[in-house]
Interface confidence: low
């Protein structure tokens, strides 16, 4: 059987190193060797590259080496496959060396800001040594902020043949670290160099970008004053490196600016004690270069009726995100404030908040929340300076089985009945929404029975038991992830009821045990 016709010939010119062609098939059923015929010097010359029978049989690649690598030039390539039964030739292919030239990557030696020029970085690099001197090179500059995985790209060409090259990258963020990498190719080539080693540079610092401002309204105190917890953070889009030296807060009752109070703080939270009227609060951050734009917040009067527009809310999980969606009866509301914090009794919870614009959903990566923790999530509608009534829900990013089962006891033991009571599992041990309880009970040496009840039931009366019989029983609490058995208890049904005993006083000792 003749060898297969060589196809899919692909050639690449590694500048001043070699000219290599590959083809398929890579493997033949029987022993095959190959001959690659080349014409070069614009068709005036020809030579052969052979795969060595002893060591390179069945190897679908061959390289031509200097000094016969001519450039610029057009080559033709034809591959012959030969086995014991004969030879099969490929079609003739044509190659312009300028179009398939691959050169070394450039070497970036400096990424710096230029004094007085905002939001710009100047990149300096050395043109690759192994590149044709006269040719125009095209470049791709890839850049990203240091904490991002998403690369941006800019393409440009350089005609000059100076070894040191420069490019000014503009419209960047202030005071932000950027990672840069560069590749190049001859202008006509389809093959890019590899990427250069990455280099980091930082844009110039500016006055703070801005603040996001929020509040938690607390119940009025006995003296009528209202504690308001103000909190702020760098606005979305602010530079990662931005550091404020401090924050100026001023506030006053509506229409009464002569009662303005001012506060300076270095914290990102501050508790105000306000009267019952409407107040306006303003916060700016500052550094050595100036102040941020003013963040404004209206604190409603104590008796002000807040609007309500969120009608429903759903929390759902995707593979790696928690998504909260809500429906609103007010199409004009397009800004929302989302608060979330763990629902824990013991430790002070970490309170987080985030603004959402022009969407009725909010997404958080699962790994930003703790698995097995219940989170309270509230969404406030914000219409201009008014904040509406929140709508709240709870969510787990990952449920597990409860870390402890319900503590159980048996009460009102009768001849054929018993009332089982169990305690709710503490929040910290639930690890998910308790969806039901299952009571497993079994007479001594008897068959096990079970009864499942809703999660709002903490007591159940078992009936149709056998008189004067020892039973073991436990209650399992289940989340979506599975169930955990609680304390195992034993009880024994009575042999005779109080009524059957003729009304005499019967003191029946029963014990049940915990497991």
């Amino acid at each position: 059987v003749l060898p297969a016709k060589p196809e899919n010939i692909s050639c690449i010119f590694y500048y001043e190193e070699n000219f290599t062609c590959t083809w398929s098939p890579e493997k033949e059923a029987s022993y095959t060797w190959y001959k690659v015929k080349r014409t070069y010097s614009y068709g005036y010359k020809s030579d052969i590259c052979s795969t060595d029978n002893s060591t390179r049989g069945n190897h679908a690649s061959c390289s031509f080496l200097p000094p016969t690598i001519t450039n610029p030039d057009n080559y033709t390539i034809q591959v012959e496959a030969q086995n014991a039964d004969g030879i099969m030739k490929s079609d003739i292919t044509y190659w312009n060396l300028d179009a398939i030239m691959k050169i070394e990557p450039p070497e970036i030696f400096s990424v710096k800001s230029v004094l007085g020029i905002k939001r710009m970085l100047q990149i300096k690099w050395i043109r690759p040594v192994l590149a044709p001197h006269s040719s125009t090179l095209k470049y791709t500059l890839r850049f990203r902020t240091i904490n991002s995985a998403y690369w941006m790209e800019v393409n440009f060409t350089k005609e000059d043949i100076d070894r040191d090259e420069t490019y000014n990258l503009t419209e960047l963020q202030a005071f932000t670290e950027y990672v840069m990498t560069l590749r190049c190719a001859p202008a006509e080539s389809m093959f890019w160099s590899g990427w250069s080693q990455e280099k980091v540079g930082t844009t110039e610092e500016e006055a703070p970008y801005g603040l996001d401002l929020w509040r938690v309204l607390k119940p009025a105190m006995v003296d009528g004053r209202r504690p308001v917890q103000l909190m702020w953070k760098k606005a979305t889009g602010a530079p990662v490196l931005e550091k404020a030296l401090g924050y100026n807060i001023w506030y006053f009752p509506e229409n009464n600016t002569n009662l303005t109070e001012t506060v300076n703080t270095t914290n990102q939270t501050h508790e105000l004690y306000l009267g019952g009227k409407t107040y306006w609060v303003y916060v700016v951050s500052y550094n050595s270069l100036g102040e941020s734009p003013v963040a404004t917040l209206r604190i409603p009067a104590l008796n002000e009726k807040t609007f309500q527009c969120i009608e429903a809310m759903q929390a759902c999980l995707t593979q790696d995100q928690l998504v909260v969606e809500w429906q609103s009866s007010a199409p004009e509301v397009d800004t929302w404030m989302v608060e979330w914090f763990p629902d824990v009794d013991s430790e002070p919870s970490s309170f987080s908040w985030e603004s959402v614009s022009q969407a009725r959903n909010w997404t958080i990566q699962k790994d930003e929340l703790k698995p097995l923790w219940c989170y309270n999530i509230s969404v406030y509608p914000v219409l201009r300076d008014r904040v509406g009534q929140p709508y709240s829900t709870q969510a787990y990013v990952q449920e597990g089985i409860p870390s402890a089962g319900p503590v159980t006891q048996a009460d009102s033991i009768g001849v054929k009945t018993v009332t089982i009571t169990w305690k709710e599992i503490p929040k910290s041990k639930r690890n998910g929404f308790i969806k039901n309880y299952t009571i497993f009970y079994q007479a001594e040496d008897g068959k096990e029975f079970s009864k499942t009840v809703n999660s709002n039931i903490l007591q159940y009366r078992l009936e149709s038991l056998t008189r004067r019989t020892s039973y073991s029983l436990q209650v399992m609490a289940s989340t979506n992830a599975g169930g955990t058995n609680g304390t195992k208890i034993n009880f024994k049904t009575l042999s005779i009821s109080v009524l059957e005993g003729g009304g005499g006083s019967h003191h029946h000792h029963h014990h049940h045990h915990h497991h």
């Epitope: 870390s403 402890a404 089962g405 503590v407 006891q409 009460d411 009571t421 305690k423 503490p426 041990k429 609680g486 304390t487 195992k488 208890i489 034993n490 014990h511 049940h512 045990h513 915990h514 497991h515």
Partner: antibody, heavy 119, light 107 residues
Framework: EVQLQQSGAELVKPGASVKLSCTAS????????IHWLKQRPEQGLEWIGR????????EYDPNFQGKDTITADTSSNTAYLQVSSLTSEDTAVYYC????????????WGQGTTLTVSS | RIVMNQTPKFLPISAGDRVIITCKAS??????VTWYQQKPGQSPKVLIH???NRYTGVPDRFTGSGYGTDFTFTISTVQAEDLAVYFC?????????FGSGTKLEIK
């Protein structure tokens, strides 16, 4: 910090009764059971019984039923053990303890109250 | 009620000895056994729960094993600070019951 603080030592005459206290801090007794245990000099531990402070339900070892009474006051976060008709057999150290069912052990103990019954 | 028979009552030891204490339940208690250490004038402290699970912070020279009715508590290399009384306890069935205790004493 989770702690159980017991009342001080008692010297009581035979036939009298005594009420020992156990005050919790760092947790709410309504969220767990409080148990009482007895340890006579140079002897092992005996389980007297326990209370569910959330509803007052109790359970006793039959050996202590009628003799000992366990109560709780959730407003002061305190559990009590009353021992009546005291005899020399009641001379012991009495411990209150919180039981951790999730891992099957007493995870928090009071420091113990020494009760001496003597005429 | 379930009786926990603990042996020995007293155990003379020298530093570096291997200590083995046994507890035999009058009926199966599965693995619902806890071992406690009690030093003079102190409340008991958990060493092992669920028969073989070392409690948080307990040195690994303390081990427990067993299931059903026979349980063993071992101190691989006893140290001076281990002088104490050791109790087993079952919580499989109410009332909870304890072994009578094993007192480690210097030879």
């Amino acid at each position: 910090e989770v702690q159980l603080q017991q009342s001080g030592a008692e010297l009581v005459k035979p036939g009298a009764s005594v009420k020992l206290s156990c005050t919790a801090s760092g947790f709410n007794i309504k969220d767990s059971f409080i148990h009482w245990l007895k340890q006579r000099p140079e002897q092992g531990l005996e389980w007297i019984g326990r209370i569910d402070p959330a509803n007052g339900n109790t359970e006793y070892d039959p050996n202590f039923q009628g003799k000992d009474t366990i109560t709780a006051d959730t407003s002061s976060n305190t559990a009590y053990l009353q021992v009546s008709s005291l005899t020399s057999e009641d001379t012991a150290v009495y411990y209150c303890a919180r039981y951790y069912y999730g891992n099957s052990h007493f995870d928090c103990w009071g420091q113990g109250t020494t009760l001496t019954v003597s005429s | 009620r379930i009786v926990m028979n603990q042996t020995p009552k007293f155990l003379p030891i020298s530093a570096g000895d291997r200590v083995i204490i046994t507890c035999k339940a009058s009926q199966s208690v599965t693995n619902d056994v806890t071992w406690y250490q009690q030093k003079p004038g102190q409340s008991p402290k958990v060493l092992i729960h669920y028969a073989s699970n070392r409690y948080t912070g307990v040195p690994d020279r303390f081990t427990g094993s067993g299931y059903g009715t026979d349980f063993t508590f071992t101190i691989s290399t006893v140290q001076a600070e281990d002088l104490a009384v050791y109790f087993c306890q079952q919580d499989y069935s109410s009332p909870f019951t304890f072994g009578s205790g094993t007192k480690l004493e210097i030879k």
